[in-house]
């Protein structure tokens, strides 16, 4: 499987769109910052088989998509940017799905790293809980936007490492 330059371009576009989505100054939200305990070890990419790493990346994209496609999210962000963001994420998920199939074969079930997938899910649960507790305030969304950009950067770095392995 070759995570192509196109995929890399999608990653950059996703981050660019997230940057453009900002609506308020993050400096008015310093007190709202929160440690969501990003599962960084799951993105170090050394201990994984390639299929497992791709599965973790796919879960990251899926959870990001879920988070930003809620009713509360639609109210918080610019609709046009959000639509473009969905398209980029959807494209990345498709690329990753194709890669998983290629890596493990159509007939086989991917050797999923269940613990890693669960760690990503729990990470997003913490984010969702934070947003609920903060009543989906503009600052809460701004903190989450910065957090997701940071985690997408980790995803991008893992994908770069996977490409180098090809």
């Amino acid at each position: 499987c070759n995570l192509s330059q196109t995929h890399s371009l999608n990653n950059r576009r996703t981050l660019m769109l997230m940057a453009q989505m900002r609506r308020i100054s993050p400096f008015s939200c310093l007190k709202d910052r929160h440690d969501f305990e990003f599962p960084q070890e799951e993105f170090d990419g050394n201990q994984f088989q390639k299929a497992q790493a791709i599965s973790v990346l796919h879960e990251m994209m899926q959870q990001t998509f879920n988070l930003f496609s809620t009713k509360n999210s639609s109210a918080a962000w610019d609709e046009t940017l959000l639509e473009k963001f969905y398209i980029e994420l959807f494209q990345q998920m498709n690329d990753l799905e194709a890669c998983v199939i290629q890596e493990v074969g159509v007939e086989e079930t991917p050797l999923m790293n269940e613990d890693s997938i669960l760690a990503v899910k729990k990470y997003f649960q913490r984010i969702t809980l934070y947003l609920m507790e903060k009543k989906y305030s503009p600052c809460a969304w701004e903190v989450v936007r910065a957090e997701i950009m940071r985690s997408l950067s980790f995803s991008t770095n893992l994908q770069k490492r996977l490409r180098r392995k090809d």
């Epitope: 940057a19 939200c29 310093l30 910052r33 929160h34 440690d35 903190v143 910065a146 940071r150």
Partner: antibody
């Protein structure tokens, strides 16, 4: 690779204004906040303020609110800082620095610094 | 403004020994799990270099002999074992609230 190229040494008279530049390369200029930091000879570092080149948003240290003006021209990948009503206290090295890790607000890449000397 | 007090102002440490630099904030710079304190190294005639972010996270490419610890108002930078190339001035910086401020610096000399 990431580079921040600052303008050269400036000699200015008290009361005058100076505008220094910081040309960025090797990364997406519009999506990273750019900080400016002051260092007086043999002294520590002072945070002046920060600009988001993507839309020109700025946040200043109140101490420098009437002293410094931060701007950016995205087509030139360049950030600028203008210092007005110069006094001897403004003689210093001024660094532009790229924001790092989003809302952690650390600084990873630094320009080489612009030396401003105020003298009559 | 949050004042960061660094101590000592200067110290001389023998090669291979431990250097400990302290940074005390006039107000807590920790919130919800993160401590917004960072450490930089500046060698004479050079620009500052980020060593540690969020109190204890080693920046990529920085040798593991550098470590940071602390939370709330009290933070420490440790260098062990000290090497010749570590001779520099070290600054702490907080990003807990506006304005961000730096400590006054600690000059490390290698004996």
């Amino acid at each position: 690779q990431v580079q921040l190229q600052e303008s050269g040494t400036v000699l200015a008279r008290p009361g005058a204004s100076v505008k220094m530049s910081c040309k960025a390369s090797g990364y997406s200029f519009t999506t990273y906040w750019m900080h400016w930091v002051k260092q007086r000879p043999g002294q520590g570092l002072e945070w002046i303020g920060v600009i988001y080149p993507g839309n020109g948003d700025t946040t200043y240290n109140q101490k420098f609110k009437d002293k410094a003006k931060l701007t950016a021209v995205t087509s030139a990948n360049t950030a600028y800082m203008e210092l007005s009503s110069l006094t001897n206290e403004d003689s210093a090295v001024y660094f532009c620095t790229r924001n790092y890790k989003y809302d952690y607000y650390t600084m990873d890449y630094w320009g080489q610094g612009t030396t401003v000397t105020v003298s009559s | 403004d949050i004042v960061l007090t660094q101590s000592p102002a200067s110290l001389a440490v023998s090669l291979g020994q431990r250097a400990t630099i302290s940074c005390r904030a006039s107000k807590s710079v920790s919130t919800s799990g993160h401590s917004y304190m960072h450490w930089y190294q500046q060698k004479p005639g050079q620009t500052p270099k980020l060593l540690i972010y969020l109190a204890s996270n080693l920046e990529s490419g920085v040798p593991a002999r550098f470590s940071g610890s602390g939370s709330g108002t009290d933070f420490t930078l440790n260098i062990h074992p000290v090497e010749e190339e570590d001779a520099a001035t070290y600054y702490c910086q907080h990003s807990g609230e506006l304005p961000f401020t730096f400590g006054s610096g600690t000059k490390l000399e290698i004996k």
